[in-house]
């Protein structure tokens, strides 16, 4: 049943959810945690359970991608009566428990964030011993990793009829806007390809026809910063030399 606690300040927002006679299983996580690549982030997770004063063995687990089936990125186990949760798995050594599972807190710290860490994470606790029970967050917490632009590839490629085209690929979050500048170009926002499937932070811009020799510069910019890189086109004897 639901009981609304009205304290003397008449605060109605703190509605406590109870199941008779004890608390039911629930897990509380925020919708999202946002952090910059290279920094650390805390993924909060607290839980309630119906087993009052449970003191037996427990395991805390975090998985990525999807609940119940996603790969584990962290796991620790605490022996009966122990407040110390011994780490059994920490993917790439970057995950560590910040909370205290004995006190209903499974919060996890993730170090040295990368764009690839941008996904949903799910906390889970398992009781073993006199009581066998387990619970996992269904919706999880989304880790939103932001990053200043970085140009990962810039190149000049031959195209039909002895012409050349330039490609620039950059990563960043928010996805960066790309612009080309160069001989007789001024500053042109080149045709931008949509981020590739499975590469949500990568954006590619193409200059379809390079008509003049010289230096072509690709600039990537988002709210966190900008980056640029150049290629040089020199045509001689029907061939091209391109360098970055």
């Amino acid at each position: 049943f639901v009981r609304t606690k009205i304290d003397t300040t008449e605060n109605l927002l703190n509605t406590e959810v109870h199941s008779s006679p004890a608390q039911r299983w629930s897990m509380q996580v925020p919708p999202e945690v946002s952090a910059e690549a290279g920094d650390a982030a805390v993924l909060p997770c607290t839980f309630t359970h119906p087993h009052r004063h449970y003191d037996g063995p427990l395991t805390a687990i975090w998985r990525a991608g999807e609940p119940y089936a996603g790969p584990q990125v962290f796991r620790c186990a605490a022996a009966r009566g122990s407040e110390l949760c011994q780490t059994a798995l920490s993917l790439h050594g970057r995950f560590r428990l910040l909370g205290n599972p004995r006190r209903n807190d499974l919060s996890l710290r993730v170090e040295r964030l990368a764009l690839a860490d941008d996904r949903r994470y799910f906390c889970r606790v398992e009781f073993a011993g006199d009581v066998h029970d387990r619970y996992e967050s269904r919706h999880g917490v989304r880790l939103h990793v932001t990053a200043a632009p970085r140009i990962v590839n810039i190149s000049v490629l031959p195209s039909p009829a002895h012409a050349f085209r330039a490609l620039c690929t950059a990563e960043g979050e928010p996805p960066p806007a790309l612009a080309w500048s160069g001989p007789a170009l001024g500053n042109s926002l080149a045709a931008v390809r949509s981020p590739r499937e499975g590469h949500g932070h990568l954006v590619t811009a193409e200059l379809p026809a390079l008509t003049h020799d010289g230096r072509y510069t690709c600039t990537a910019a988002n709210s966190l910063g900008r980056s640029e890189a150049s290629v040089y086109l020199f045509r001689f004897h029907g061939a091209s030399g391109a360098s970055t």
Epitope: T8, T9, N14, T15, Q28, S34, L98, S107
Partner: antibody, heavy 124, light 113 residues
């Protein structure tokens, strides 16, 4: 009634540390997050982080990482916020504020009770 | 981080008239899993700490007069005071609690015309 009472005003020199206390009454201290929010003179509100008094778990805003430490003493229902390596731009009023009810199933992390604020002046 | 932008920065309204303050978030604070907007409004009077007015974008905190109402969804939100009273002179802040770190708008100063 719910009350958060903070320690008095402080004047510090650059490079020093300050520790502000926040004594809670009128509710179960370990049932709610405690947030710290600061407000520079004539400016808006800036969230610094929280402590979960039940587990002692903390979460700090990135810009304060390495300089802020939030602790609590459950025996006297008091939360503390220590800020080190003070600079002149740390001059502000620092507030503690009660946050989410830990047992509530939705992430309703609004600040429904606030301390009176502690003025911290950093000046050489 | 989610950036919260309020408009206008200041507002002068006659007593008894309607006051409207807007808040825009740089990304949506609507959570599809429960269809709730993780947005709150606070009132801060001079020399006082902030006071919670509204949460879930439109739910009034107990004890808050019903002339205060919140609306909006996704990225665009509004705090409305239907009939301005002298005691409503304050700075009003929106805050998102969808994404950590939590962020506030820069504030809107409400005065009497």
């Amino acid at each position: 009634q719910v009350q958060l009472v903070q320690s008095g005003a402080e004047v510090k020199k650059p490079g020093a540390s300050v520790k502000v206390s926040c004594k809670a009454s009128g509710y179960t201290f370990t049932d709610y997050y405690m947030h710290w929010v600061r407000q520079a003179p004539g400016q808006g509100l800036e969230w610094m982080g929280w402590i979960n008094p039940n587990s002692d778990g903390t979460n700090y805003a990135q810009r304060f990482q390495g300089r802020v430490t939030m602790t609590r003493d459950t025996s006297i229902s008091t939360a503390y916020m220590e800020l080190s390596r003070l600079r002149s731009d740390d001059t502000a009023v620092y507030y503690c504020a009660r946050g989410r009810l830990l047992r509530f199933f939705d992430w309703l992390d609004v600040m429904d009770a606030w301390g009176q604020g502690t003025s911290v002046t950093v000046s050489s | 981080d989610i950036v919260m932008t309020q408009s206008p920065d200041s507002l002068a309204v006659s007593l008894g008239e309607r006051a409207t303050i807007n808040c825009k978030s740089s990304r949506s604070v609507l959570y599809s899993s429960n269809n709730k907007n993780y947005l709150a409004w606070y009132q801060q009077k001079p020399g006082q700490p902030p006071k919670l007015l509204i949460y879930w974008a439109s739910t009034r905190e107990s004890g808050v007069p019903d002339r205060f109402s919140g609306s909006g969804s996704g990225t665009d939100f509004t705090l409305t005071i239907s009939s301005l009273q002298a005691e409503d002179v304050a700075v009003y802040y929106c805050q998102q609690y969808y994404s950590i770190p939590y962020t506030f708008g820069q504030g809107t100063k409400l005065e009497i015309k």
